[in-house]
């Protein structure tokens, strides 16, 4: 016999779900145990069957899921999955916020990413802070040179995608550059997009040659300048 446990906790990491009104929300709490546990759902601590909800809810026990279509502001709250068997029980809370604001292009915090100067061999972090009503996707791009040119015939820059991520709104997205070399110097762009459009801001990384060892020992790993 075994008490219930989460089989895919990595799928439960997104605790806060901030979604626009009219969207579909799906909460999952995949679990196992012996005997096979049962799952039930609470909303704000009360048993939740969706009978008072327009459009009702879909409970798929074999998928350990709760689905609500066309969410409205009254759906806001804390949703708890309670998984139990004869041996024990576990629970997990999801927070649902239903957004009624006019969704807009992502807004990037001014000054980020910031121009940065680093020494060869040091580590650098470039930061990008994104505000977005809809869940934004982020790309970190490095501007590159092809055949001696930074721009194509169409006038647009050559870029290389370094990292792609989907993040929660108002999170800080970080690009880590380890053990930088002279080749890492150049222009970096944080590009954020959502269903309305794209926004992007750029910064320059300057990489200096290795300093005298006695100086380096006392110096910070990277210096940040505006």
């Amino acid at each position: 016999q075994q008490a219930p446990y989460w089989t895919h906790p990595q799928r439960m990491e997104k605790k806060l779900h901030a979604v626009p009104a009219g969207n579909t929300v799906k909460f999952r709490c995949p679990a196992a145990g012996n005997p096979t546990p049962t799952i039930r759902w609470l909303k704000d601590g009360q048993a939740f069957h969706g009978e008072n909800r327009i459009g009702g809810i879909r409970l798929r026990h074999q998928h350990w899921s709760l689905v609500m279509e066309s969410v409205v502001p009254s759906d806001r709250g804390t949703y708890t999955c309670l998984v139990e068997n004869a041996v024990g029980s576990i629970r997990y809370n999801y927070l649902l916020d239903v957004l009624e604001r006019s969704p807009h292009r992502p807004i990037l915090q001014a000054g980020l990413p910031a121009n940065t100067t680093a020494v060869v061999g040091s580590d650098v972090e470039l930061l990008c802070k994104v505000y977005s009503d809809a869940q934004p996707h982020i790309q970190w791009l490095k501007h590159i040179v092809i055949n001696g040119s930074s721009f194509g015939a169409d006038g647009f820059p050559y870029v290389q995608v370094l990292k792609t991520a989907d993040i929660n709104s108002s999170e800080v997205e970080v690009l880590y550059l380890r053990n930088v070399s002279a080749e890492d110097a150049g222009e970096y762009t944080c590009l954020a997009g959502n269903s309305i459009g794209l926004s992007y801001q750029s910064a320059w990384l300057t990489v200096l040659p290795e300093e005298d060892p006695t100086w380096t020992a006392a110096a910070p790993e990277a210096r940040y300048t505006d």
Partner: antibody
Framework: EVQLLESGGGVVQPGRSLRLSCAAS????????MHWVRQAPGKGLEWVAV????????YYADSVKGRFTISRDNSKNTLSLQMNSLRVEDTAIYYC?????????????????WGQGTMVTVSS | DIVMTQTPLSLSVTPGQPASISCKSS???????????VYWYVQKSGQPPQLLIY???NRFSGVPDRFSGSGSRTDFTLKISRVEAEDVGVYYC?????????FGGGTKVEIK
């Protein structure tokens, strides 16, 4: 060639339903948000709805909220608009429009490619 | 919602002469990234709208250089330096900064 082709329009009675489709070709459909825009006969343009590249986010004009549902099938490069409880004022040409992509915008970040449109007539 | 107000309603122009269309938004379309998200379209008879200008002043590929966009924050202008017969149609401005995306009422350009 980048192309959007709408279908599914027709004549329908008030209160009934209709489903519009838009077949996309010539670009990576799954990397773009997609919109529906409509135009009543002899009138201007009205934005209807948008869906994000992966279908996770949808937004609607107040005039259609609760009646229309936008959806997509990235495996089939298809955008859909399910229109329920149709009203006479929904009579219009419905255009499928490409929205913002996921990568660096080499030009406008969307609203550059429009389909030819499909006519929906709601009449008793 | 952002209201886009376009003037004039119609415009009759002699070929070779300039034309100017105004569009005003009820809120600033200047975004935090420094771009101004106003787009201009032309719709010719029986066709879908075609993009002319994006992000205030950028000409879309294939658009003749007689078309130009300008303005700032809430006041925008589309100029045709020398109108040609093929320029007849209805011109629309659009804000592309937030949902619901909104269009101006349109300006009908005719040839004298």
């Amino acid at each position: 060639e980048v192309q959007l082709l709408e279908s599914g329009g027709g004549v329908v009675q008030p209160g009934r339903s209709l489903r519009l489709s838009c077949a996309a070709s010539g670009f990576t459909f799954s990397s773009y948000a997609m919109h529906w825009v409509r135009q009543a006969p002899g009138k201007g343009l009205e934005w209807v709805a948008v869906i994000s590249y992966d279908g996770s986010n949808k937004y609607y004009a107040d005039s259609v909220k609760g009646r229309f549902t936008i959806s997509r099938d990235n495996s089939k490069n298809t955008l859909s608009l399910q229109m329920n409880s149709l009203r006479v004022e929904d009579t219009a040409i419905y255009y499928c429009v490409r929205g913002a992509g996921r990568g660096f915008p080499y030009g406008p970040d969307g609203f550059d490619i429009w389909g030819q449109g499909t006519m929906v007539t709601v009449s008793s | 919602d952002i209201v886009m107000t376009q003037t004039p309603l119609s415009l009759s122009v002699t070929p070779g002469q300039p034309a100017s269309i105004s569009c005003k938004s009820s809120r600033s379309l200047l975004h935090s990234d420094g771009k101004t998200y106003v787009y201009w379209y032309v719709q010719k008879s029986g066709q879908p709208p075609q993009l002319l200008i994006y992000e205030l002043s950028n000409r879309f590929s294939g658009v003749p250089d007689r078309f130009s966009g300008s303005g700032s924050r809430t006041d925008f202008t589309l100029k045709i330096s020398r109108v040609e017969a093929e320029d007849v149609g209805v011109y629309y401005c659009m804000q592309y900064i937030e949902a619901p995306l909104t269009f101006g009422g349109g300006t009908k350009v005719e040839i004298k």
